[in-house]
């Protein structure tokens, strides 16, 4: 029979012939040959192949640098890579997470719409009208401002994006 | 196929490299170990080189050994200081936990 | 590394009689474990590989099993071509090392 020139899936052609992929967790060894199936073996401590492969070699699993402010957030198999993350207060400079920043606090004026994650830093948003912020905060929204009226009281300062309304006595009627 | 060269004759205390030659398969997708037998004896596994070119060894090994690809189609074993229980028949043979393609063998002996 | 151990050093059957060789490792090997043929002034020829599969050519009157640190080769119906030495080989992961059982004997009379 005419020698293959292609392959079927999880299948790789040497040598005129087509051999078996090795399967996730294993590296390619030796090629197959008309009297053996490809010799695969499996990745060490500490290594991974992720895909179908001939690989000679495994990958070796992401260090999660302590000194870059990352831990481990999931243990590396010899199927998958270790996923880094970054400890409380940090999150992650890129999706490889290869290194961590400080989250950002929001500076007054503007109130936190998405706490930050391992992985996304602080969302800030402008406080809209009827709402403050007077701190620098990783985790406060904007407060909405005081209701003078329900307190019995009348707005004796007017609010911004930064301050809370004042409040004060009404005035008595004079007889 | 894979063939053995360089066994012979040596003093103790002399070193000595045997070659691999391998045709038909490529040594840069496929590993080579190095075995070798005493006479009336059983097999021995020395150690591997990888298609990467890593070389792993026995622990017994480790130290007296030393493997590597010297062109593209041979592989050598490289002996430092031998003694008379090196006296052997070498093989190196295709393959890394199991071996399908084995050379006939060079015999080393060491004697005085 | 793993240590294979190989029973029994010597076995005689008459032709048509059954051989079982039983090779132990000193640590679990998963099924990474070969076994070998070898004839006097010959090479070792391969037999079996990932514990019990047959190398293209091999008389399917050789079946080999086991996984962990148990495994065994079982030669029927034997012929006198089967008289030789019996190897096992087994893979140590955790350093990336080989090792071959001490080998069984087979006499065929």
């Known amino acids: 029979p005419e020698p293959p020139t292609a392959c079927r899936e999880k299948q790789y052609l040497i040598n005129s012939q087509c051999c078996s992929l090795c399967q996730p967790g294993q590296k390619l060894v030796s090629d197959c040959t008309e009297f053996t199936e490809t010799e695969c073996l499996p990745c060490g401590e500490s290594e991974f192949l992720d895909t179908w492969n001939r690989e000679t070699h495994c990958h070796q699993h992401k260090y999660c640098d302590p000194n870059l402010g990352l831990r481990v957030q999931q243990k590396g198999t010899s199927e998958t890579d270790t996923i880094c993350t970054c400890e409380e207060g940090w999150h992650c400079t890129s999706e490889a997470c290869e290194s961590c920043v400080l989250h950002r606090s929001c500076s007054p004026g503007f109130g936190v719409k998405q706490i930050a994650t391992g992985v996304s830093d602080t969302i800030c948003e402008p406080c809209p009208v009827g709402f403050f912020s007077n701190v620098s905060s990783a985790f406060e929204k904007c407060h909405p401002w005081t209701s003078c009226e329900t307190k019995d009281l009348v707005v004796q300062q007017a609010g911004t994006n930064k301050t809370d309304v004042v409040c004060g006595p009404q005035d008595r009627l004079r007889a | 196929s894979v063939e053995e060269s360089g066994g012979r004759l040596v003093t103790p205390g002399t070193p000595l490299t045997l070659t691999c030659t391998v045709s038909?398969?490529?040594?840069?997708?496929?590993?080579i170990s190095w075995v070798r037998q005493a006479p009336g004896k059983g097999l021995e596994w020395i150690g591997v080189?990888?298609?990467?070119?890593?070389t792993y060894f026995a622990s017994w090994a480790k130290g007296l050994f030393t493997i590597s690809k010297t062109s593209s189609t041979t592989v050598d074993l490289q002996m430092t200081s031998l003694t008379t229980e090196d006296t052997a028949t070498y093989f190196c043979a295709r393959g890394w936990s199991r071996h399908d393609f084995w050379g006939p063998g060079t015999l080393v002996t060491v004697s005085s | 590394d793993v240590v294979m151990t190989q029973t029994p050093a010597s076995v005689s059957e008459p032709v048509g009689g059954t051989v079982t060789i039983k090779c132990q490792a000193s640590q679990s090997i998963s099924n990474i474990l070969a076994w070998y043929q070898q004839k006097p002034g010959q090479p070792p020829r391969l037999l079996i590989y990932s514990a019990s599969t047959l190398a293209s050519g091999v008389s399917s009157r050789f079946k080999a099993s086991g996984s962990g640190t148990e495994f065994t080769l079982t030669i029927s119906d034997l012929e006198c071509a089967d008289a030789a030495t019996y190897y096992c080989q087994g893979y140590d992961s955790t350093v990336g090392v080989g090792a071959f059982g001490g080998g069984t004997e087979v006499v065929v009379k």
């Open positions: 080189i990888d298609a990467g070119g890593s």
């Open positions: 038909g398969f490529s040594l840069s997708s496929n590993a």
